[in-house]
Amino acid sequence: GVFNYETETTSVIPAARLFKAFILDGDNLFPKVAPQAISSVENIEGNGGPGTIKKISFPEGLPFKYVKDRVDEVDHTNFKYNYAVIEGGPIGDTLEKISNEIKIVATPDGGSILKISNKYHTKGDHEVKAEQVKASKEMGETLLRAVESYLLAHSDAYNEQKLISEEDLGGEQKLISEEDLHHHHHH
């Protein structure tokens, strides 16, 4: 059977910046900002696009040693990322795969809403364990907040490159950043 679980969460971080860090550079960021959750991410095949296989290893003490993810879609325009957990972790006798979709939607205040869909494909008439869904959400929460905290502390990271810096302008004129574009954007 297929069991679909959907959740939404918010972030004060602009959508484009969050997509760049959390989705496009998660492989590098996660072990750095959340070593208690992920110890390493290794590209087994592919270059990050559809068909790429990644091996995510977890630190000792966590229930699972690793999972393998297959990238299904990366939509840079709509900030959408589809991937499937295809091996390791909970995948086994009762669970065939978990198809995941993350969409980051810009909000009028300059932040974002993350819309997350997790489809558990079970074998036969097996059901999904509630604790597995909870553990998955908790992992997602840990990674998102760790990345978010990193971005809040490093304002220059994962922003569009600026050709002229504020210093070059003598500090008199402030360049418009992605965040400034949303500044006092009232709807």
């Epitope: 959907e6 959740t7 939404e8 969460t9 918010t10 004060v12 971080i13 602009p14 909000t107 009028p108 205040d109 300059g110 932040g111 809403i113 959400k137 908790e138 997602g140 929460e141 998102l144 907040r145 978010e148 905290s149 809040l152 965040e179 949303h182 500044h183 006092h184 954007h185 009232h186």
Partner: antibody, heavy 122, light 108 residues
Framework: QVQLVQSGAEVKKPGASVKVSCKAS????????LHWVRQAPGQGLEWMGL????????YYTQKFQGRVTMTRDTSIDTAYMELNSLRSDDTAIYYC???????????????WGQGTMVTVSS | DIQMTQSPSSLSASVGDRVTITCRAS??????LNWYQQKPGKAPKLLIY???SLQSGVPSRFSGSGSGTDFTLTISSLQPEDFATYYC??????????FGQGTRLEIK
């Protein structure tokens, strides 16, 4: 501990403006949305809008559009809500509330200020 | 905007009673429903978020259930400190956020 402390009660005349402050402490101010909710005497809760303290951006409900401005000063971890062209039916307690920031739900109000009573009377 | 309707508007109950308050949304809001308790002269307090998750520090006699359009808040055994007004609030997808009109719980 985590708390929001609001400015004191205000008495205003119709047509005037009021600016209520909300001082945050005990957490990273820029990481959590701040909401403004009001409650007229003996009435229910009414959401006015939200402020993103990181970007400075905001969202106001249609009812308050053009009359309300939500701002912040990150150097002192304080949010402000200014309401213009006050009318007698704006008499209410105004609350600031911090978002829970949960992976399970957007926009749940976890921490509340003590409220600021604004009375509009001629 | 999504309308939230609570029932009953008020109810009288005794200490030890099991009490249920319902909240209905004008359209499906998935599980994006929160419950608050407000005592006279005080700010509201978050009890339940995401329809059924108990907020940290809230006694386990409070529970929430429901999904889609119909939700309930249950107090399994009323305590003297539970007499207050209860509000439901939806936060489906994007603003505007709306509250129910409130349910006043009084001592019988």
């Amino acid at each position: 501990q985590v708390q929001l402390v609001q400015s004191g009660a205000e008495v205003k005349k119709p047509g005037a403006s009021v600016k209520v402050s909300c001082k945050a402490s005990g957490y990273t101010f820029i990481a959590y949305y701040l909401h403004w909710v009001r409650q007229a005497p003996g009435q229910g809760l009414e959401w006015m809008g939200l402020l993103n303290p990181y970007t400075g951006g905001s969202y106001y409900t249609q009812k308050f559009q053009g009359r309300v401005t939500m701002t912040r000063d990150t150097s002192i971890d304080t949010a402000y809500m200014e309401l213009n062209s006050l009318r007698s039916d704006d008499t209410a307690i105004y609350y600031c509330a911090r978002d829970k920031r949960s992976y399970y739900i957007p926009y749940a109000f976890e921490i509340w200020g003590q409220g600021t009573m604004v009375t509009v009377s001629s | 905007d999504i309308q939230m309707t609570q029932s009953p508007s008020s109810l009288s109950a005794s200490v030890g009673d099991r009490v249920t308050i319902t909240c209905r949304a004008s359209q499906s809001i998935s599980s994006y429903l929160n419950w608050y308790q407000q005592k006279p002269g005080k700010a509201p307090k978050l009890l339940i978020y995401a329809a059924s998750s108990l907020q940290s520090g809230v006694p386990s006699r409070f529970s929430g259930s429901g999904s889609g359009t119909d939700f309930t808040l249950t107090i399994s055994s009323l305590q003297p400190e539970d007499f207050a007004t209860y509000y439901c609030q939806q936060s489906y997808s994007t603003p505007p956020i709306t509250f129910g009109q409130g349910t006043r719980l009084e001592i019988k």
